[in-house]
């Protein structure tokens, strides 16, 4: 499988919220055996490779924002800890899954990494992230709501978020 | 903060069995692996094998299949590795150690010395 | 089984020196993780992902390498890093360690 990022940039005026979103792509096992532990973290555009180095997000690290589940369920965090920093990340039935920020700082300006590890009978791992920029404004030159690019791969016509 | 803490040191005899306990606290105990290592003395270390308490889930080195039983109580968050048939060769300081899918043993306990000796 | 070959097994360095460790999978490996063990103590994540410093650590450390061959240096050796650097890889069960390397003081 792989990982897709809709969005490969988000511009967002101070104070709105943003959905940073990845997507699994591929077949997906749904085993018994296969479990899925999906999180997300800033970093850097390393030389070597993008999303090497493991950040935290707003204090909180890639391991307080985990997400661990089997292949068929849906999950979302419901940490205290998470909510407090204005955080959620959630994962669905099809794939997707998301970190929201809420009300933007420009402290928030950089780049995130989706991370997903498939697990199969605890002792065989699959890694693979997706990396995305987020832009925070303000001033007069700031969106009045976040603004999104569609990567490369898709549409290049950029699409305002609802 | 993270922690780690493990039952006290054990003598036993060869043939015996022994149950080491690891009690942690201070993050989401189903959110990681938990893993044991051994050092034998003077030597290098050894994975054990490692138990999710997500699920339960197990997986362990061939060499201690059969003979090392990894077990956790979710309601206490403590991880236990249960050692049988011992011999002289399995004293060592055991060690519990989390790790979170996809990168590395972050945090460890601060072992157990186990002796076999008749 | 892969097999990890930490060389060499010891060095004996002064306080300042440059030194470099290397350790060789038999087959290839995605990613090297380093810890440092002192006498009497557990062992301490150094380096994950073959090249990023884990929480607290000395930016004097860093790490290198890819598929087989990977590399740990200490820029400037000081008197706390004398330890045993223990190599590791999750790449394919079951997961193992190299030998180690002691670093002591010459």
């Known amino acids: 499988f792989k990982v897709a990022t809709p969005y490969s940039l988000y511009v967002c005026p101070e104070g709105q919220n943003v959905t940073l979103t990845c997507r699994l792509l591929g077949p997906v096992d749904k085993g018994h055996d296969v479990t899925f532990y999906k999180t997300w973290y800033r970093s850097s555009r390393g030389e070597v490779q993008t999303c090497s180095e493991r950040r935290p997000i707003r204090n909180l690290t890639f391991q307080d924002l985990h997400l661990h589940h089997g292949g068929h369920q849906a999950a979302n965090t419901s940490h205290d800890l998470a909510q407090r920093h204005g955080l959620e990340s959630a994962s669905d039935h099809h794939g997707n899954f998301s970190i929201t920020m809420r009300n933007l700082t420009l402290l928030d300006s950089g780049l995130y990494c989706c991370l997903v590890v498939e697990i199969r009978h605890h002792h065989s791992e699959h890694r693979v992230h997706g990396a995305m920029e987020l832009q925070v404004q303000t001033g007069k030159d700031a969106p009045s709501n976040c603004v999104v690019y569609p990567s490369s791969s898709q549409d290049s016509e950029n699409i305002t978020a609802a | 903060q993270v922690q780690l803490v493990q039952s006290g040191a054990e003598v036993k005899k060869p043939g015996a069995s022994v149950k080491i306990s690891c009690k942690a606290s201070?993050?989401?105990?189903?959110?990681?692996?938990m893993n044991w290592v051994r050092q034998a003395p003077g030597q290098g270390l050894e994975w054990i094998g490692l138990?999710?308490?997500?699920?339960?889930?197990?997986s362990y080195a061939q060499k201690f299949q059969g003979r090392a039983t990894l077990t956790v109580d979710t309601s206490t968050s403590t991880a236990y590795m249960e050692l049988s048939s011992l011999r002289s060769e399995d004293t060592a300081v055991y060690y519990c150690?989390?790790?979170?899918?996809?990168?590395?043993?972050?945090?460890w306990g601060q072992g157990t010395l186990v002796t076999v000796s008749s | 089984e892969i097999v990890l070959t930490q060389s060499p097994a010891t060095l004996s360095l002064s306080p300042g020196e440059r030194v470099t460790m290397s350790c060789s999978a038999s087959?290839?490996?995605?990613?090297m993780y380093w810890y440092q063990q002192k006498p009497g103590q557990a062992p301490r994540l150094l380096i994950y992902?073959?090249?990023n410093l884990a929480s607290g650590v000395p930016a004097r450390f860093s790490g290198s390498g890819s598929g087989t061959d990977y590399t740990l240096t200490i820029s400037s050796m000081e008197p706390e890093d004398f330890a045993v650097y223990y190599c590791?890889?999750?790449?394919?069960?079951?997961?193992?360690f190299g030998q180690g390397t002691k670093l002591e003081i010459k």
């Open positions: 201070g993050f989401s105990f189903t959110g990681y692996t």
């Open positions: 138990i999710s308490p997500y699920d339960g889930g197990t």
């Open positions: 150690a989390r790790r979170a899918y996809g990168y590395a043993m972050d945090y």
């Open positions: 590791q890889q999750w790449s394919s069960y079951p997961f193992t």
């Open positions: 087959s290839s490996v995605s990613y």
């Open positions: 992902d073959t090249s």
